[in-house]
């Protein structure tokens, strides 16, 4: 059974996936952002169902395409490289969702673009976490 | 409603110039990409070029790199295509269209090239 | 550089189902927009972001890709949807727009 201080050690690490998975939110729907609607035309695959941690997996899956595609706007849109933003969502990913576990994420029949994918992920981090609380 | 507006086109010879110009309304053109997009006679559609919104990116079809120009003009409303050196398969109908990916489109200005 | 492709021609009887191909490369990572032009008319929008219907196209109209393939169907297929139909994406970069070569669609 998940003790308190590793449900504790789980929510601090969703909090921050939230806080980087805005941060990129806001980062390319800004209005000063030239790239948005190119960017628009990437599509990102959403998960069937997301409701667990292990759900995750589909996410990592699909942090390489992310990075690609903020390649594309301008930096100073973000505190950081994407290279360095998208490492930074891996290795969170990677201890939520546990690395021994192998789970195979199935994908939904439905693409999204990138603030549809971003908004997802953001919504599975906020009903985690409040089921946490 | 949206609407765009084409004009200049016309019979020029081989080695010409033309400039087309597209007058746009109805929309807030400055927050969107234009494009043109030509079609030869019974053919099918060819993207031209396109612009973001303050003209600081511009990509263009190989077969028109170095000839053709695209610009607009945020204060007028207006998208230009400064087409030089033109050849005989530069003969086409061009439509002024709104968007990166494309919602809209005028009724387009016939360009013939021949001598 | 970059290719769309279509086949150039699809028949159905009114009431059928068409469907129209396009393959491209960049399709798995792209999204594909349709266009519908009809004889001496401009173009018209019927499909974008491979799924999505523009408001005021009829119901019949949809879209779905798998893989390098995207695919307008039109489901009962009338007398007036009879016309050319374009598919349209961009490169893996997003530099490159393209149009497919087109499909006439006759509905007999």
């Known amino acids: 059974a998940p003790t308190s201080s590793s449900t504790k050690k789980t929510q601090l690490q969703l909090e921050h996936l939230l806080l980087d998975l805005q941060m990129i939110l806001n980062g390319i729907n800004n209005y000063k952002n030239p790239k948005l609607t190119r960017m628009l035309t990437f599509k990102f695959y959403m998960p069937k169902k997301a409701t667990e941690l292990k759900h995750l997996q589909c996410l990592e899956e699909e942090l390489k395409p992310l990075e690609e595609v903020l390649n594309l706007a301008q930096s100073k849109n973000f505190h950081l490289r994407p290279r360095d933003l998208i490492s930074n969502i891996n290795v969170i990913v990677l201890e939520l969702k546990g690395s021994e576990t192998t789970f195979m994420c199935e994908y939904a029949d439905e693409t999204a673009t990138i603030v549809e994918f971003l908004n997802r992920w953001i919504t599975f981090c906020q009903s985690i976490i409040s089921t946490l609380t | 409603q949206v609407q765009l507006v084409e004009s200049g086109g016309g019979l020029v010879q081989p080695g010409g110039s033309l400039r087309l110009s597209c007058a746009a309304s109805g929309f807030s053109f400055s927050t969107h990409w234009m494009t043109w997009v030509r079609q030869a006679p019974g053919k099918g559609l060819e993207w031209v070029a396109n612009i973001n919104q303050d003209g600081g990116e511009k990509y263009y079809v190989d077969s028109v790199k170095g000839r053709f120009t695209i610009s607009r003009d945020n204060a007028k409303n207006s998208l230009y295509l400064q087409m030089n050196s033109l050849r005989a398969e530069d003969t086409a109908l061009y439509y002024c269209?709104?968007?990166?990916?494309?919602?809209?489109w005028g009724q387009g200005t016939t360009v013939t090239v021949s001598s | 550089s970059y290719e769309l492709t279509q086949p150039p021609s699809v028949s159905v009887s009114p009431g059928q189902t068409a469907r129209i191909t396009c393959s491209g490369d960049a399709l798995p990572r792209k999204f594909a927009y349709w266009y519908q032009q009809k004889s001496g008319q401009a173009p018209v929008m019927v499909i974008y972001?491979?799924?999505k219907r523009p408001p005021g196209i009829p119901e019949r109209f949809s879209g779905s890709s798998s893989g390098t393939m995207a695919t307008l169907t039109i489901t009962g297929a009338q007398v007036e949807d009879e016309a050319d139909y374009y598919c349209?994406?961009?490169?893996?970069?997003?530099?490159?727009?393209?149009f497919g070569g087109g499909t006439k669609l006759t509905v007999l």
């Open positions: 349209y994406s961009t490169d893996s970069g997003g530099d490159v727009s393209v």
């Open positions: 269209a709104r968007g990166y990916t494309i919602s809209d």
């Open positions: 972001e491979d799924s």
